[in-house]
Each structure stands twice: as C-alpha cells, then as structure tokens.
C-alpha cells in the first residue's frame, strides 16, 4: 500500500478520504486506526455504525469522526481541532470479524497555524529533504510520501 499524506493546520479540522471498491467491500464495516510504531499494531480509533445500513451516520470518538458512503465507496474521517500529537501514521480499514483489510495508509501532518505566533517547535511533520517510501500525492491538503521518506518522526 502507498502512503498518502494529509496535512492540516493546528487547531483546525482535517478531513481524510479513503476511496474503496464499494462492491468488493459490500456489507463490511469500516474503521480508522492509528499505527503504533513502524511494525506495531494498528490501534482502533473509531469505527462505523454497527449496522452497515447506517454507516452514513457520523460516529465520533473524542475529536475524531467517521462516516461511510457505502454506495459511492468513500470513507471519510474528520479530525477536529487538530493537535501536534495527532501527527502520525493511520489506516483506513475494512472489517471482517476481528480482522481487517487495509484500504489506505495515511500519514497525518500537523502544520503550525500561521496566525499563531507561539513556539511551533513541537509541531512535527516530515521535512521535504527526508525521503519516504511508496509515495503518491493527493491533496486535502495532502500528498504522498517521497521515496525513502519515513512515516515516523525521529526518536531521540
């Protein structure tokens, strides 16, 4: 799977879209999870309504919402009041029982609010000089990882 980068401004909302084949995933609930480390598990953040028929209803978990256009084949996740700690790697998933198929890998980048003059040193997003694997661009603001870029911030 390619990783698609979605950039949002701190304090604002970010909308992430995950297109999928609506016929292939017919009847399957969807979820949004956060990748814990490069090889770690993907921790569920929020999932669509228990009844697939009602997947269009927005479901919230804290500041994250999910809604699914099951006929059009687009899963939409909204991250409200985006914060620096929201930056990281996520997945859109299609569920079957306790297992899941990855629909899209997403890197969320949090940009400093240009109107906010506080120290933005804690806002992390990958530098353009770093290189990322499996890149492809899509704007939300979004882009794909550049070849060789790593989806996790460097740890000290």
């Amino acid at each position: 799977h390619n990783t698609t980068v979605f950039q949002g401004v701190a304090g604002q909302s970010l909308q992430v879209s995950c297109p999928y084949d609506s016929m292939k995933h017919w009847g399957r609930r969807k979820a949004w999870c956060r990748q814990l480390g490069e090889k770690g598990p993907c921790q569920r953040v929020v999932s669509t309504h228990n009844l697939w028929l009602l997947s269009f209803l927005r479901r919230w978990n804290g500041s994250t919402a999910i809604t699914d256009d099951t006929l059009g084949g687009t899963l939409t996740i909204t991250l409200r009041n985006l914060q620096p700690h929201d930056a990281g790697l996520y997945q859109c998933q299609s569920l079957h029982g306790s297992e899941a198929d990855t629909l899209r890998k997403v890197l969320v980048e949090v940009l400093a609010d240009p109107l906010d003059h506080r120290d933005a040193g804690d806002l992390w997003f990958p530098g353009e000089s770093e290189s990322f694997e499996d890149a492809h661009v899509e704007h939300s603001i979004s882009r794909s990882l550049l070849e060789g870029e790593i989806p996790f911030p460097p740890t000290s």
């Epitope: 084949d21 016929m23 292939k24 017919w26 009847g27 399957r28 228990n50 009844l51 697939w52 028929l53 997947s55 099951t70 079957h96 029982g97 306790s98 297992e99």
Partner: antibody, heavy 122, light 108 residues
Framework: EVQLVQSGAEVKKPGESLKISCKGS????????IGWVRQMPGKGLEWMGI????????RYSPSFQGQVTISADKSISTAYLQWSSLKASDTAMYYC???????????????WGQGTTVTVSS | EIVLTQSPGTLSLSPGERATLSCRAS???????LAWYQQKPGQAPRLLIY???SRATGIPDRFSGSGSGTDFTLTISRLEPEDFAVYYC?????????FGGGTKVEIK
C-alpha cells in the same frame, strides 16, 4: 438470467494436475466475490476459498491453503480451481457460488454452479 | 475460525409438522452475516435465508430465520413434501467463511 456454469466431470489419477472452471453470465462478473465449496461423497459442505475477480484478491480456508489455487480471468468471466498434484482424498463434488449483494449489507451465496464431479483413482 | 454446530443431526417429522433447526456459533457472529441453505440429493445448495432472518427471492414464507450472537434458528412452520432435505447454516462474518455440519430433515 444470472448463472454460473461449471466445467464437466473429471476422472484423474493421483499426482496429476487439474483445473476446473466456473463461467458467470447475466451479471457484472467483476463486482461479485466467487467462492468454491467442496462436498465429499455423503458429507457436508466445506468452504474452500473465495476470489474477487475485479482485482483477483483471494482468501483461502486454512484447510485448503497450499492445496489448491483459486484464480479468475475477468476478460472471459471465468473463475478457476486448480490442483498441481491430485490425491485420492480430493474425490468430491466441487461447487462455485456467487456471494450476493443484499440490501442492508447482507451477503449470502445466492447463485450456484451445477457442480463438477472430480474422481481421483489409480 | 468460527465453528458452526448444527443440531439435531437428523430430524424425523411428518408433512404438516413444524421443524426447528438450530445453529450455534463458537463465537459471536453479527446477524448480518448468517445464512441458511437447503440441499436436495443430486442438487446444488439453494440460498433460503440471508442476514439471519431475510428470505431470499422465491422462498416461501413458511421458512423463517431468527437469532443473534451465537444462537440461530431456522423454522419451517408447516413441512411440505418438497421440504425434506439437508439444511446448512453458513457464516460470512469472518474468514474463513464456514458451514455447519448440516441437519437432515427426513420423513417420519
């Protein structure tokens, strides 16, 4: 009319290879999963695996993983089940079936092929 | 994998009687993903019920399905001569999809 038509009965020797087919018609073949089901003589139904012809995504039952290969050629609306080396225990009736799309997100194998009898004997 | 256990193995009844077939799952299955099939000798299976309780196209209303979680039931309100067959439950909630072992409904 929506239908799945399977290839004819086969008689093979142990160790031989075999590929049986299932041709769909009357619907959009690429947008429905096609599953394969085994029924040994006098026994129940066993789910072998399933394929989505649109992108050839395939899932197998652990019991059949590595024993058979499921494939599809969407250009001719045909799914396949194949063995590289048959065993006497592969003697059975094999059915293909379509996983339907029902309102409310329900599935269910709504259209079945007529079945292909495979006999493996020395 | 999810194991489906059907009971009884054989049900001996007379035409006109009510048949109650059980299917128990080894772990919870969303009712959206439980189906019932009928199979007569020499024929391919036929879908009767999907989503645990919805009748497939052309299935008479004497067939009904119910249940949720781990316990599901297929009921034939009044057996007709053509209903004597083997019935299977099947789940497509998680991979691998699985069938129950079947219940044979035979004439008493």
């Amino acid at each position: 009319e929506v239908q799945l038509v399977q290839s004819g009965a086969e008689v093979k020797k142990p160790g031989e290879s075999l590929k049986i087919s299932c041709k769909g018609s009357g619907y959009s073949f690429t947008t429905y999963w096609i599953g394969w089901v085994r029924q040994m003589p006098g026994k129940g139904l066993e789910w072998m695996g399933i394929i989505y012809p649109g992108d050839s995504d395939t899932r197998y039952s652990p019991s059949f993983q590595g024993q058979v290969t499921i494939s599809a050629d969407k250009s001719i609306s045909t799914a396949y089940l194949q063995w590289s080396s048959l065993k006497a225990s592969d003697t059975a009736m094999y059915y293909c079936a379509r996983a339907g799309h029902y309102d409310g997100g329900h599935l269910g194998m709504d259209v079945w092929g007529q079945g292909t009898t495979v006999t493996v004997s020395s | 994998e999810i194991v489906l256990t059907q009971s009884p193995g054989t049900l001996s009844l007379s035409p006109g009687e009510r048949a109650t077939l059980s299917c128990r799952a080894s772990q919870s299955v969303s009712s959206d993903y439980l189906a019932w099939y009928q199979q007569k000798p020499g024929q391919a299976p036929r879908l009767l019920i999907y989503g645990a309780s919805s009748r497939a196209t052309g299935i008479p209303d004497r067939f009904s399905g119910s249940g949720s979680g781990t316990d599901f039931t297929l009921t034939i309100s009044r057996l007709e001569p053509e209903d004597f067959a083997v019935y299977y439950c099947q789940q497509d909630y998680s991979y691998p999809w699985t069938f129950g072992g079947g219940t044979k409904v035979e004439i008493k």
